[in-house]
């Protein structure tokens, strides 16, 4: 296309632009580290920072983790996009009783209208079923079992919802994790993980469980709830959620009815050895950002030891004195070797003693 040649030539003379043959246009060249939001960016605002998979760019221009909808009671409403988080909502037949940012912390099954009541507004992912008294003189047809259950707590406009559990009768008719079904009997066999600090000094006939909720008459829609800081695992046991109480850990996801709390190393640290739902050993992230390196080039020829910063702080990237030595107490499994032309060891202190209360393994 000869008519495009002059336009193409004008791009060649401008280092901030390039010619895209596919669209036959001059396009703005995004600076290093930024990526185009469209095929042929025209201006700097068409470039953006690129986040890793399952992260999005928030309003403060930070890469932030998208929420996960991996719990059994959640479904994805909107996917994780470059500039917005994934959004989760309660699965059909349930509503959100405790909301969370872009998700729901606790889903409950929609209430069943008791005898003498009919559905005024069906339940949604956000709201429970709203019941109203049936018209005078009209009894429920009982064609739908939903309208033939006994009231759970008197005749009220909205019956008390039931927390979702794989062990409830309602849940046991639905596939749970990989298509398996948890039988109701599992609820009677609930046990707790040993020695969880959360249950110390709490006498209970069945440790790890809260007192049994009374079932609404004529309904099996109830379950034994685990104590606070316990979750119902896939085998139907109450298991202690891991603790993120170590100084080098922060909570990533909370302890939910059917999933453990998860912990991760605090910012500026990296997980050197993982543990179930947590990190057994966090170490300060050993590589400084490129722009913070202050080591003069001529020092690259010398053997230099970098001392680890205090727990949780970033390495300052400044070399210690030339003959500085690593602390004698550093054990072999606690350090990372820094190798940038010369051999430089970075002793890494271990984190606080590992005391995870997840499954007693």
């Amino acid at each position: 296309f000869p008519q495009d040649r002059p336009f193409e030539d004008t791009c060649h003379g401008n280092p901030s632009h390039y010619y895209d043959k596919a669209v036959r246009r001059c396009c703005y060249r995004c600076p290093m580290g930024l990526f185009p939001t469209q095929q042929c960016p025209q201006r700097p605002t068409d470039c953006r920072k690129q986040c890793e998979p399952d992260y999005y760019l928030d309003e403060a221009d930070r890469c932030t983790a998208c929420v996960t909808c991996s719990r059994d009671d959640l479904v994805e409403k909107t996917p994780c996009a470059w500039n917005s988080s994934r959004v989760c909502e309660c699965r059909p037949g349930m509503f959100c009783s405790t909301s969370a940012v872009n998700s729901c912390a606790r889903c409950f099954f929609h209430s069943v209208c008791p005898a003498g009541m009919i559905v005024k507004f069906p339940g949604t992912a956000q709201k429970n079923t709203v019941c109203e008294p049936a018209s005078p003189g009209v009894s429920p047809a009982c064609a739908s079992p939903e309208n033939c259950k006994e009231p759970s707590s008197g005749t009220i406009p909205q019956a008390k919802p039931t927390p979702v559990s794989p062990a409830t009768s309602s849940a046991s008719t639905m596939p749970v994790r990989g298509g398996t079904r948890l039988a109701q009997e599992a609820a009677s066999k609930l046990t707790r993980a040993p020695d969880s600090p959360s249950s110390v000094g709490r006498p209970s006939s069945d440790p790890g469980l809260s007192p049994t909720q009374p079932c609404p008459e004529g309904s099996g829609d109830c379950r034994k709830q685990c104590e606070p800081d316990y979750y119902l695992d896939e085998a139907g046991r109450c298991t202690a959620c891991v603790s993120c109480s170590r100084d080098d850990l922060v909570e990533k996801t909370p302890c939910a009815w059917n999933s453990s709390r998860t912990c991760e190393c605090r910012p500026g640290m990296i997980c050197a050895t993982s543990a179930t739902n947590s990190c057994a050993r966090c170490v300060p992230y050993p590589i400084c950002a490129a722009e913070t390196v202050t080591k003069p080039q001529d020092m690259a020829e010398k053997d230099t030891t970098f001392e680890a910063p205090p727990l949780g702080t970033q390495p300052d990237c400044n070399p210690t004195p030339e003959n500085g030595e690593a602390p004698a107490s550093t054990s072999p499994t606690q350090s990372l070797l820094v190798d940038s032309q010369a051999s430089k060891t970075l002793p890494i202190p271990t984190s606080a003693p590992v005391a995870l209360s997840s499954t007693g393994k």
Epitope: M32, G33, F35, Q50, E52, Y55, C63, K252, T262, C263, E264, C265, R266, P267, M269, I270, C271, T273, S274, A275, T276, N277, S278, C279, A280, C282, Y285, I287, A290, V338, D339, S340
Partner: nanobody
Amino acid sequence: EVQLVESGGGLVQPGGSLRLSCATSAFTFDGPDMAWYRQAPGKGCELVSIISADGRTYYADSVKGRFTISRDNSKNTVYLQMNSLRAEDTAVYYCALDPRKNCRGGYCCANWGQGTLVTVSS
């Protein structure tokens, strides 16, 4: 989505060598640090080595002097040269993108790729 594909694993005798490769898409490759993690049977996910975008490298004590990490930005690939292999190096090896951000929890094994199995046995 960024995909990481690890390869190069296999069965090797103690003292032998292997070279692992991790290929990824060009879209984000030349910016972030890259790392190798490994997970031995029944063990947790363990940090092995990190390489920064400008080539600075870090090694866990258990592999220093034996393993060498490198990257070729033009091929969008990071490598792990493993020499003097020992039985305790037997594990599935995974590469991880931008460990500073993505490897704060214990989930940098099998985060993107399937890993490559290294078995050291006589």
